[in-house]
């Protein structure tokens, strides 16, 4: 009778992570008597995957009933495959012996390759906000994919970016891989509504790439422009001065009025108007009682935006042209906030 052969008909098997792998193996004879075992790898460090007769292998099931007389099919199924399961699997026939069974013949091996999807790309921007014309870096990371081949692209508002560097780790063979990319983006004043997108394409995604996004609203700071103007006289001895704070982002802003360098009033921007580009406008006004002043008044609108050093704009108020009203001791009326703000 011809000597037993162990046949593994599949040289390789490709399985998606999470699925079940079927590893086929048949023997050509029932003799010699002894169990079949499956190993991953060869040599002394090989890992036992399944023993026909003993041991605990909760992920493994046999394709056929091994207790059936004359069974020669020793194929197995391994459930819930992960990239860590990749490797070459050997079906090995043992001959009964004492004290231990002896390896008799091995199959040629089946290489199991695992396709694993990349994780959703995570895009992160700089820790601190930056102003227009500055260049900022964004990073994109995705993990756990296999095989190694992967494509990563960057977009800003649908326009592909070219200034980026990408690494796939590790460089050598591994059960799964990670990608890390850093893109440089130049900010403009119109970027409050802009998005930076990292797009990852991989064979496991069937042409439907994964995207990670970052909103530039989290990154940009658009400093305000200030304009202080004097409005027509409201009453014989009152002048209305407005401070227009335009095109700023984010909204966090505090405004202080100074009269000849002395703080007159401080307020925080609350009800603002939003521009089409996502920046904000705000207006504050001050009623100045000119009769309280003998000399010209220097009015300063000082704005502290988003924790940055204050910027200011001044206006010289000429009082000589206005008649003095006796008995007034207030230089400026601290009017109610509704009256102060013009929307």
């Amino acid at each position: 009778e011809e000597e037993l052969q162990v046949i593994q008909p599949d040289k390789s098997v490709l399985v998606a992570a999470g699925e079940t792998a079927t590893l086929r193996c048949t023997a050509t004879s029932l003799i010699p008597v002894g169990p079949i075992q499956w190993f991953r790898g060869a040599g002394p460090g090989r890992e036992l995957i399944y023993n026909q007769k003993e041991g605990h292998f909760p992920r493994v099931t046999t394709v056929s009933d091994l207790t059936k007389r004359n069974n020669m099919d020793f194929s197995i199924r391994i459930g819930n495959i992960t990239p860590a399961d990749a490797g070459t699997y050997y079906c090995v026939k043992f001959r009964k012996g004492s004290p231990d069974d002896v390896e008799f013949k091995s199959g040629a091996g089946t290489e199991l390759s695992v396709r694993a999807k990349p994780s959703a790309p995570v895009v992160s921007g700089p820790a601190a906000r930056a102003t227009p014309q500055h260049t900022v870096s964004f990073t994109c990371e995705s993990h756990g994919f296999s095989p190694r081949d992967i494509t990563l692209k960057w977009f800003k508002n649908g326009n592909e970016l070219s200034d980026f560097q990408t690494n796939v780790d590790p460089v050598g063979e591994s059960v799964s891989y990670s990608i890390h990319s850093t893109a440089k983006v130049v900010l403009t004043r119109e970027d409050v509504h802009s998005q930076v997108i990292c797009e990852v394409a991989h064979v496991t995604l069937q042409g439907d790439p994964l995207r990670g996004t970052a909103n530039l609203s989290e990154t940009i700071r658009v400093p305000p422009t200030l304009e202080v103007t004097q409005q027509p006289v409201r009453a014989e001895n009152q002048v209305n001065v407005t401070c227009q704070v335009r095109k700023f982002y984010p909204q966090r802003l505090q405004l202080t009025w100074l009269e000849n360098g002395n703080v007159s009033r401080t307020e925080t921007a609350s009800t603002v108007t939003e521009n089409k580009d996502g920046t904000y406008n705000w207006m504050s006004w001050l009623l100045v009682n000119v009769s309280a002043h003998r000399d010209d008044v220097k009015l300063t609108c000082q704005v502290e935006h988003d924790g940055q050093p204050a910027v200011s704009k001044s206006h010289d108020l000429k009082v000589s042209a206005h008649p003095k009203e006796q008995g007034s001791n207030t230089a400026a009326e601290n009017t109610g906030s509704n009256e102060r703000n013009i929307y």
């Epitope: 007769k53 041991g55 091994l66 207790t67 004290p99």
Partner: antibody, heavy 113, light 108 residues
């Protein structure tokens, strides 16, 4: 559901023999080896031996060679452990086990005159 | 035969404490064939860790196993009252199969 049901407690005299049983349900005992393990009160576990019910092949720990005999009856899906020439040293709980995962509830054997 | 020596034989740990039990083999054991069992008084042993590092079904994630060759260990990252039990290592790499002497783990 896989279960291993062992026979009830035994009280036997020194010098006598006893045969403990382990009946399997939820699987065919031919598909895996059946093991027997000894545990004396407040002590560790000792592997006695195992049987391949498919062909009756057995292996024993040297300490239990000649003391223990393991057999199996595939028609009743049952494995047996026979212990001979009993002494007080054989007083223990005896477990049957399959694939290291499934264990019987244990049979208490007391050897006393 | 392969002799498995467990240490310590008895130990007590406070809740939240990290615990490491060791199992030393007299000759090399392939990691695929090294199992750990938990046993509580009056109960059959339960498979706790198989193939050195795989947790059996229902075993809390605070347990882990590691090792190779002649040195193996079971670790509990943060001791809980329900972990008080005896733990046995077991090898089925070479006949005769053998158990370690066990470690009795108590809660303080």
């Amino acid at each position: 559901e896989v279960q291993l049901q062992q026979s009830g407690a035994e009280l036997v005299k020194p010098g006598a023999s006893v045969k403990l049983s382990c009946t399997a349900s939820g699987f065919n005992i031919k598909d895996s080896y059946m093991h027997w393990v000894k545990q004396r009160t407040e002590q560790g576990l000792e592997w006695i031996g195992r049987i391949d019910p498919e062909d009756g092949e057995t292996k024993y720990a040297p300490k239990f060679q000649g003391k223990a005999t393991i057999t199996a009856d595939t028609s009743s899906n049952t494995a047996y452990l026979q212990l001979t020439s009993l002494t007080s040293e054989d007083t223990a709980v005896y477990y049957c086990a399959r694939r290291g995962f499934y264990w019987g509830q244990g049979t208490t054997l007391t050897v006393s005159s | 035969q392969i002799v498995l020596t467990q240490s310590p034989a008895i130990m007590s740990a406070s809740p939240g404490e990290k615990v490491t039990l060791t199992c030393s083999a007299s000759s090399s054991v392939s990691s695929s064939y090294l199992y750990w069992y938990q046993q509580k008084p009056g109960s059959s042993p339960k498979l706790w860790i198989y193939s050195t590092s795989n947790l059996a079904s229902g075993v809390p994630a605070r347990f882990s196993g590691s090792g190779s060759g002649t040195s193996y260990s079971l670790t509990i990252s943060s001791m809980e009252a329900e972990d008080a039990a005896s733990y046995f290592c077991y090898q089925w790499s070479t006949h005769p199969y053998t158990f370690g002497g066990g470690t009795k783990l108590e809660i303080k």
